[in-house]
Amino acid sequence: NEGSVTGSCYCGKRISSDSPPSVQFMNRLRKHLRAYHRCLYYTRFQLLSWSVCGGNKDPWVQELMSCLDLKECGHAYSGIVAHQKHLLPTSPPISQASEGASSDIHTPAQMLLSTLQSTQRPTLPVGSLSSDKELTRPNETTIHTAGHSLAAGPEAGENQKQPEKNAGPTARTSAT
């Protein structure tokens, strides 16, 4: 159904191979990514309320697919920390993040509630709640497949257990 307006391969925005997304746009994609669909010549990325497509061979497309596969994007994505308290001189931010069972959070409202209720993470990454408006959009459609929603995913229940220690001094957050 490639090209179909109603099918999983409909594109809201097509990114040309000649002009890959900027770093800022990639960060936005990482943060809001909910799913991807492999189409014939391109991949469609489903975000909270819109979609974007790119050529299957484009490096940024491969990177985003890998990111979602490894659960490093989307719901679980915490974003780069710009400013954070409790920093040790040579250590990265105290993450306090922990992962729990994959609770099947079916609605954006529940996702927001889950995030707000998480008192285990006093040092939230900057911008981690910047998508509140998107999370509660009334026109957001949650597509259910095999008992899971796009709003949830592997380890969607993270940050709901006890706090954890973060990595030691060798895990650096400086820009590469």
């Epitope: 697919m65 890998s66 490894l70 915490s78 069972a101 990454p125 008992g147 990595a167």
Partner: antibody, heavy 118, light 113 residues
Framework: EVQLVESGGGLVQPGGSLKLSCAAS????????MNWVRQASGKGLEWVAR??????????FYADSVKGRFTFSRDDSKNTAYLQMNSLKTEDTAMYYC?????????WGQGTLVTVSS | DIQMTQSPSSLSASVGDRVTITCKSS????????????LAWYQQKPGQSPKLLIY???TRQSGVPDRFSGSGSGTDFTLTISSLQAEDFATYYC?????????FGGGTKVEIK
């Protein structure tokens, strides 16, 4: 060729410390989610710890049995992961495997043996 | 935590036999975000580290003979060895990587009949 080489294992007394290292090559280390898994002699496999990638602030997660005693870290510039193990107990005796989870599969090292005994 | 139940715990078979090992998870391992099942199968021989055979439930790892195949979705998975070879006698584990903590099946020891 993907390679994960663990080192740092050995014999240590209860209450002692060890630091395991995992040197990686053959794949993009910075994009991999790293884990440690252990296996006591004749037993099954037990997950120990996980560390996420830089975009997720290198967040770490631990099995309940090691929480507060073990610390997982990574240095992407050196393609190396570390497991600092403190307050070791006899039940921590096992072969420790470093694993790299990538979209192309889960790679394992050959392991390093940790023996905690008095 | 997701529980992984593997069966049988051991089996005896002969070279050339078709062997089937099953693994059941306590919750679905299928992620709607990419339609992938977060399940892997390993082979382990005494004194060696686990060797990845199958990931994403059905994708054969590079270099693994095609007599090994994985199938299933959601909560029920199967590893099939179509024609058992002498070098296949080992212990096999399933593993879910859908959620932290990663959890493993108890293992299936494939022995020579």
């Amino acid at each position: 060729e993907v390679q994960l080489v663990e080192s740092g294992g050995g014999l240590v007394q209860p209450g002692g410390s060890l630091k395991l290292s995992c040197a990686a090559s053959g794949f993009t280390f910075s994009n991999a989610v790293m884990n440690w898994v252990r296996q006591a002699s004749g037993k099954g496999l037990e997950w120990v710890a996980r560390i996420r990638t830089k975009p997720n602030n290198y967040a770490t997660f631990y099995a309940d049995s090691v929480k507060g005693r073990f610390t997982f870290s990574r240095d992407d510039s050196k393609n190396t992961a570390y497991l600092q193990m403190n307050s070791l107990k006899t039940e921590d005796t096992a072969m420790y495997y470093c694993t790299a989870w990538t979209t192309e599969g889960i790679y394992w090292g050959q392991g390093t043996l940790v023996t905690v005994s008095s | 935590d997701i529980q992984m139940t593997q069966s049988p715990s051991s089996l005896s078979a002969s070279v050339g036999d078709r062997v089937t090992i099953t693994c059941k998870s306590s919750q679905s391992l299928l992620y709607s975000g990419n339609q992938k099942n977060y399940l892997a199968w390993y082979q382990q021989k005494p004194g060696q580290s686990p060797k990845l055979l199958i990931y994403w439930a059905s994708t054969r790892q590079s270099g693994v003979p095609d007599r090994f195949s994985g199938s299933g979705s959601g909560t029920d998975f199967t590893l099939t060895i179509s024609s058992l070879q002498a070098e296949d006698f080992a212990t096999y584990y399933c593993q879910q990587y859908y959620d932290t903590p990663w959890t493993f099946g108890g293992g299936t020891k494939v022995e020579i009949k």
